[in-house]
């Protein structure tokens, strides 16, 4: 797997351990918490991520769920399983036997249930909704700017395919950035959305994970973009199966 | 290599305005905003607003709204920082400064304009 | 306004000594830290942006650490050069900088 040869560290996660180990002595990084190979070319997948952040746990924080279907991380960190490609394994188990079905985001579609629970298949997060409120700036952005600036971020810092970005809408001080990528468009090598916005939160709230960077600060046209508050939705391809009390909770 | 150039230092009687000018050479000027920066004898950095030259749009802190007005002229590259009704309390140091080319830090400054306010 | 407060306002060290400096914010800052260098009759000078991430040419003893409300400064081995107030300074919400800590020669 490639990485920077000269002082062997992984590009795109710093959430390694990288030694000169691989064929030919070449660089090769392995991810904190699961000790699997990653490639250092590309993104890591959430579900590696979760698992080497968990082996240097911090405080979770938490949204706000706001529709019946769509889907928002409310549980906060914890340690996945993953399977061997590092994506999340359908059914989730904490140690005290208490499990959960997941999407391909891994975040909980079901509601918990014991090591009975069976989770047929990893369901696809096909439809992610970045919702994002700025701060007061000079003016309005102007939308064809901003829609081209964040493009332009999904395409070069996060390795995104632009015809997974759907469309960014702007109603100040809202920014609303559509990522869409169905099974059947997914080729291999194509960074996967649910990849792309974890990442991309995690640089919202200043914990980049690319080696040897800070936070993620935007400008448009030279305005500086200060986000006051970020919400992430997540639509699967089949609705997810919560019993009545919880939507009405 | 990127400068910032302020104009000299003034002194002015109480009630009087000053214009304070920032000539920024080594970049492409309407790329980032210019941050104009108070520093009173013996105080804290205090950040007054910015401009952005690329549509002469300005950001104030409250403390300085109809205190400073921020301008900008893109032919000559340069942005300049107007404080009127003046009193002894806007004796200080006055910086521009532009952003770090990733984050909204600030990483090339000017060399300060004192500004005297005496009667 | 996120306000910052820096401790100590003043520390006396010596050449080699490990110095800290504080900053705290009044609501979380999600890293959106910078600390600055400033010597008499200069301007300031950036030293670490992001909490962590180190200026291009700025030497390797400072490091900068923290997360949410509580960040910090550190010079491993104070040189003769160190000798100057230093400031924090957030970004996440427009700009406000800490009083600043002036580090002096004991």
């Known amino acids: 797997h490639t990485a920077a040869q000269d002082n062997c560290t992984c590009p795109t996660n710093k959430m390694t351990v990288c030694s000169p180990d691989g064929p030919g002595g070449r660089c090769q990084c392995r991810a904190l918490g699961s000790g699997m190979a990653v490639d250092c070319s590309t993104l890591t997948s959430k579900c590696l991520l979760l698992k080497a952040r968990m082996s240097a746990p911090k405080n979770a924080r938490t949204l706000v769920r706001p529709s019946e279907h769509a889907l928002v991380d409310n549980d906060g960190l914890y340690d996945p399983d993953c399977d061997p490609e590092g994506r999340f394994k359908a059914r989730q188990c904490n140690q005290t036997s208490v499990c959960w079905c997941v999407n391909s985001v891994g975040v909980r579609r079901t509601d918990k249930g014991d090591l009975s629970l069976r989770c047929d298949e990893l369901v696809r997060t096909h439809h992610i909704l970045i919702d994002l409120r700025h701060r007061p700036t000079a003016g309005a952005f102007n939308h064809s700017d901003l829609d081209a600036e964040l493009r332009r971020l999904f395409r070069e810092r996060y390795r995104l395919h632009p015809k997974f970005v759907a469309a960014v809408h702007y109603e100040q001080p809202t920014i609303q950035i559509e990522l869409r990528q169905n099974t059947s468009q997914k080729a291999a090598g194509d960074v996967d959305i649910g990849d792309a916005a974890y990442y991309f939160e995690r640089d919202i709230k200043g914990e980049s994970l690319f080696q040897g960077r800070g936070g993620l600060d935007l400008r448009v046209r030279g305005e500086p973009l200060q986000v006051e508050r970020t919400l992430i939705y997540y639509l699967d391809e089949i609705p997810p199966k919560f019993s009545m009390k919880r939507l009405t909770a | 290599q990127v400068q910032l150039v302020q104009s000299g230092a003034e002194v002015k009687k109480p009630g009087a305005s000053v214009k304070v000018s920032c000539k920024a050479s080594?970049?492409?000027?309407?790329?980032?905003?210019i941050h104009w920066v108070r520093q009173a004898p013996g105080q804290r950095l205090e950040w007054m607003g910015y401009i952005n030259p690329n549509n002469d749009g300005t950001k104030y802190n409250e403390k300085f709204k109809g205190k400073a007005t921020l301008t900008s002229d893109k032919s000559s590259t340069t942005a300049y920082m107007e404080v009127r009704g003046l009193t002894s309390e806007d004796s200080a140091v006055y910086y521009c400064?532009?952003?770090?080319?990733?984050?909204?830090?600030?990483?090339?400054w000017g060399q300060g304009t004192l500004v005297t306010v005496s009667s | 306004d996120i306000q910052m407060t820096q401790s100590p306002s003043s520390l006396s060290a010596s050449v080699g000594d490990r110095v800290t400096i504080t900053c705290k914010a009044s609501?979380?800052?999600?890293?959106?830290l910078a600390w600055y260098q400033q010597k008499p009759g200069k301007a300031p000078k950036l030293l670490l942006y992001?909490?962590?991430s180190l200026e291009t040419g700025v030497p390797s003893r400072f490091s900068g650490s923290g997360s949410g409300t509580d960040y910090t400064l550190t010079i491993s081995s104070l040189q003769p050069e160190d000798f100057a107030t230093y400031y924090c300074q957030q970004y996440w919400n427009t700009w406000t900088f800490g009083q600043g800590t002036k580090v002096e020669i004991k």
């Open positions: 992001g909490a962590t």
């Open positions: 080594g970049y492409t000027f309407t790329t980032y905003v």
């Open positions: 609501e979380d800052i999600f890293n959106r």
């Open positions: 400064a532009r952003p770090h080319f990733e984050t909204h830090a600030m990483d090339y």
